[in-house]
């Protein structure tokens, strides 16, 4: 019964790590306009991994995408790469556990496979929610260098007249959803190796065991009986204890919508 | 077409406050920021503030944080600015004009509601 | 606050002629995010409020006529009315729309020769 709980919530915290993972991906705030210096400005900025958008005071938000692939900076490919390789591995990894999931029967499937398949989907979940962190981190240490040499240079002036505040940029909403998404997947994914080890079949054989009935001292051989323990190769016909009382897990992957104003 | 109606000239004494509406038709009220703006005689524009219909959200010029105040009432489509404590320098003509949504300039304006504050 | 600077404070000109007047502001109105001036030109005529002409400091508001242009970048803007027409004798007003709290320059008024 544990594994079944251990195996269904690490696959939900994963579905739910893979929708932020998802999310934070799409979202247009990776970093937002560094507001400390000047509080008062009426246009507000914020760039996301696909597109750029301004947000006027009036309402109006203007988004332009980023129309080019060899103009982009290194990193911010880096980071794109990561963060699909991370939606891809969940993905399938999810995938894999809908059918790995003890609560749920499919055909002839032995607990054996079933143990193998939660190993496969915890590890990919592993895998996602590291990419997904590295993407991020990677994207916050390249906002955190640019902030500061930004900072260095902040005005530059004509006699000391005018002066130009340069935009600088800080951690926007997307990098703690993906953080936060991260390591939701990191640790379904975790619980499901877990589940996994309680899931892999135990070859327990009782040794002699002697019945002393009335009159007759019948002694069964060794090997001659296997421990019905559900996990057996035999258990194929001799069910004895079906952990999934049929309880359909309904898991919905509620999209995430952004309201591009 | 859009319309912005203000209320008819006041003259007020120093210290009293005075309350200008702005009735708005033609378009979503609620939809648009509403800029107060004022020009003394013979001066030139003033910024004074701005508020949202839908949130009621405001932004004041600090030079009139303490002395203003801006409401509406969305189920007359008006907009109201009250400015207290008046002084003989807030003599001056008083526009409400219209948040222009493909950019930050308000594009439709009021006629002007002059006050005057004497003693 | 963002000071805006006016120039010349008064213009003679007649009709037919190319007008340009200037605006200056304490500090860049240039949006790094979407590579925009925010910087607005309206009309006033005497007793009338205030007309908007253009807004990102070079487009023009619909139904305003050709003849008005802007144009500049960062600190110093420039509004020309390239053939002056009766109509068009006014005060105009440049205005920092960046940053909080808006601010008007003192304005140009604009007057028959």
């Known amino acids: 019964m544990a594994v079944t709980a251990c195996q269904g919530l690490g696959f939900v915290v994963s579905l739910i790590g893979i929708a932020g993972i998802i999310a934070a991906t799409c979202m247009d705030q990776w970093s937002t306009q560094d507001l400390y210096n000047n509080p008062v400005t009426a246009v507000f900025n914020y760039q996301g991994l696909w597109r750029s958008c301004v947000r006027e005071s009036s309402g109006f938000t203007e988004c332009r995408g980023y129309f080019t692939l060899l103009g982009l900076p290194a990193m911010l490919q880096a980071v794109r790469a990561l963060m699909i390789v991370g939606i891809v591995l969940g993905a399938i990894g999810l995938l894999v556990s809908i059918f790995a999931l003890k609560c749920i029967r499919i055909g002839s499937m032995e607990d054996s496979a079933k143990a193998n398949m939660t190993l496969t989907s915890g590890i990919m979940f592993i895998v996602s929610g590291l990419c997904a962190i590295a993407g991020v981190s990677v994207f916050a240490n390249m906002l955190v260098t640019n902030f500061w040499m930004s900072t260095a240079n902040m005005y530059t002036g004509m006699g000391g007249m005018v002066q130009t505040v340069q935009t600088r940029y800080t951690f926007g909403a997307a990098l703690f959803v993906g953080w936060v998404a991260g390591g939701l997947t990191l640790i379904g994914g975790v619980m499901m190796c877990i589940a996994c080890r309680g899931l892999a079949p135990e070859e327990t054989n009782y040794k002699a065991v002697s019945y002393h009935a009335s009159g007759h001292s019948v002694a069964y051989k060794p090997g001659g009986f296997k421990a019905s323990t559900g996990f057996g190769s035999n258990t194929k016909n001799k069910k004895i204890y079906d952990g999934g009382a049929r309880t359909e897990d309904e898991v919905q992957s509620y999209p995430s919508k952004h309201d591009y104003v | 077409q859009v319309q912005l109606v203000q209320s008819g000239a006041e003259v007020k004494k120093p210290g009293a406050s005075v309350k200008v509406s702005c009735k708005a038709s033609?378009?979503?009220?609620?939809?648009?920021?509403m800029h107060w703006v004022r020009q003394a005689p013979g001066q030139g524009l003033e910024w004074i503030g701005m508020?949202?219909?839908?949130?009621?959200?405001?932004n004041y010029n600090e030079k009139f944080k303490s002395r203003v105040t801006m409401t509406v009432d969305t189920s007359t489509s008006t907009a109201y600015m009250e400015l207290s404590s008046l002084r003989s320098e807030d003599t001056a003509v008083y526009y409400c004009?219209?948040?222009?949504?493909?950019?930050?300039?308000?594009?439709?304006w009021g006629q002007g509601t002059t006050v005057t504050v004497s003693s | 606050d963002i000071q805006m600077t006016q120039s010349p404070s008064s213009l003679s000109a007649s009709v037919g002629d190319r007008v340009t007047m200037t605006c200056k502001s304490s500090?860049?109105?240039?949006?790094?995010?979407?590579?925009?001036?925010?910087l607005t030109w309206y009309q006033q005529k005497p007793g009338k409020a205030p007309k908007l002409l253009i807004y990102?400091?070079?487009t023009r508001e619909s139904g305003v006529p050709s003849r008005f242009s802007g144009s500049g970048s960062g600190t110093d803007f420039t509004l020309t009315i390239s053939s002056l027409q009766p109509e068009d004798f006014a005060t105009y007003y440049c205005?920092?729309?960046?940053?909080?709290?808006?601010?008007f320059g003192g304005g140009t008024k604009l007057e028959i020769k």
């Open positions: 500090q860049s109105l240039l949006n790094s995010g979407n590579q925009k001036n925010y």
């Open positions: 990102w400091a070079s």
């Open positions: 508020i949202h219909p839908n949130s009621g959200s405001t």
């Open positions: 033609g378009y979503t009220f609620t939809s648009y920021w």
């Open positions: 004009a219209r948040r222009y949504y493909g950019s930050i300039s308000p594009d439709y």
């Open positions: 205005q920092n729309d960046y940053s909080y709290p808006f601010t």
